[in-house]
């Protein structure tokens, strides 16, 4: 469960892939589309508001009792819209919603290296936001394999 209704911190950052492609958001027919693309040098990168929440890891899974805390993030590129996991479609979508946000809007933050992060679905452990065919998608990662798969690695630039 998320231990507080308020984020412990927030930051405004642009999101790019491991290969330095930008994640951009465009309003089309009254809904937002998410793109993964090479930006022209003079084009400004879209910013995302990341809100960080503390979450207790279920002790039955971890054996940690009260000591297993995770950082969950929500990602909002524009007011009232949040990235959400659609586990049925294996897709990542932007939805307008009110608080409290649904579980599908929360992602467990992983620092894969000092500069790279991954976002794991709160609602589907082992499934991460990733890049597939120049779009964001949900990608299942086998923990026995190398978790450094480049298609689930992202960089945050404030």
């Amino acid at each position: 469960s998320i231990t507080g209704i308020s984020p412990i911190t927030e930051s405004l950052a642009s999101l790019s892939t491991y290969n330095d492609q930008s994640i951009t958001f465009a309003l089309e027919d009254e809904s937002y589309e998410i793109y993964v693309e090479d930006l022209k040098k003079d084009k400004k990168k879209d910013k995302v508001l990341l809100s960080y929440y503390e979450s207790q890891h279920p002790s039955s899974e971890s054996g940690d009792g009260v000591d297993g805390k995770m950082l969950m993030v929500t990602l909002s590129p524009t007011k009232d819209f949040w990235l959400q996991a659609n586990n049925k479609e294996h897709s990542v979508e932007l939805h307008k919603c009110e608080k409290p946000l649904p579980d599908q809007a929360f992602f467990v933050l992983h620092n894969r290296s000092f500069n790279c992060v991954s976002f794991e679905c709160k609602t589907d452990p082992g499934v991460f936001i990733g890049v597939k065919d120049n779009h964001l998608a949900l990608i299942k990662v086998d923990y026995s394999e190398n978790l450094g798969s480049e298609n689930i690695l992202f960089k945050l630039s404030e």
Partner: antibody
Framework: EVQLVESGGGLVQPGGSLRLSCAAS????????MYWVRQAPGKGLEWVAA????????YYPESVKGRFTISRDNAKNSLYLQMNSLRAEDTAVYYC??????????????WGQGTLVTVSS | DIQMTQSPSSLSASVGDRVTITCRAS??????LDWYQQKPGKAPKLLIY???NLQEGVPSRFSGSGSGTDFTLTISSLQPEDFATYYC????????FGGGTKVEIK
């Protein structure tokens, strides 16, 4: 209860080597970033090394780069610090520390009690 | 590398005093900053994380503020058990500690 217990400290001559160990218990060791921090006698704290949960990446300040190596054995819930080419200025209490959260590099939430390394001829 | 400069390096205060310690980063670190308390012969203890959040079990007389390059740790009413050394610590770019502030009894 989270526990971190360092061992392996002692007296070593300049130019010598030492390997410190940290035995971890009470948490899922393989899910956390781990760190070594040192404190010279009467001085402040200095970060010495960091390692990712899967040991894929490690990091060092310039003061120890090329001489110290951090490693971990997730099957044994153990963290290590291999220290080579030791100098008098490496004399310090060495602490093992755990990240505050699963998977992330932020904050040193738990610390061991430290092990003293003395480099002297 | 980011340098963290703490001031003062030491201060004398009495029980009940309001104490303020400052930390300045050599470049902006947003709020990726902690405060630690260390007593002689003991390991450091996390007090404040992400600039302002109180670690579980830490008394509410401790508070943190600041963002960017300038940060403050405040003890609203100093208690006997608060005489210790305090360190700031950044994790925005690499990891580095401030030089420490020793809080002594006046």
């Amino acid at each position: 209860e989270v526990q971190l217990v360092e061992s392996g400290g002692g007296l070593v001559q300049p130019g010598g080597s030492l390997r410190l160990s940290c035995a971890a218990s009470g948490f899922t060791f393989s899910s956390y970033w781990m760190y070594w921090v040192r404190q010279a006698p009467g001085k402040g704290l200095e970060w010495v090394a960091a390692i990712t949960p899967n040991a894929g990446e490690d990091y060092y300040p310039e003061s120890v780069k090329g001489r110290f190596t951090i490693s971990r054995d997730n099957a044994k819930n153990s963290l290590y610090l291999q220290m080579n080419s030791l100098r008098a200025e490496d004399t310090a209490v060495y602490y093992c520390a755990r990240g505050q959260y699963y998977y992330t590099k932020y904050s040193l939430g738990y610390w061991g009690q430290g092990t003293l390394v003395t480099v002297s001829s | 590398d980011i340098q963290m400069t703490q001031s003062p390096s030491s201060l004398s205060a009495s029980v009940g005093d309001r104490v303020t310690i400052t930390c300045r980063a050599s470049q902006p670190i947003h709020n990726h900053l902690d405060w630690y308390q260390q007593k002689p012969g003991k390991a450091p203890k996390l007090l404040i994380y992400f600039g302002k959040n109180l670690q579980e079990g830490v008394p509410s007389r401790f508070s943190g503020s600041g963002s960017g390059t300038d940060f403050t740790l405040t003890i609203s009413s100093l208690q006997p058990e608060d005489f210790a050394t305090y360190y700031c610590f950044q994790y925005k770019k690499g990891w580095s500690f401030g030089g420490g502030t020793k809080v002594e009894i006046k």
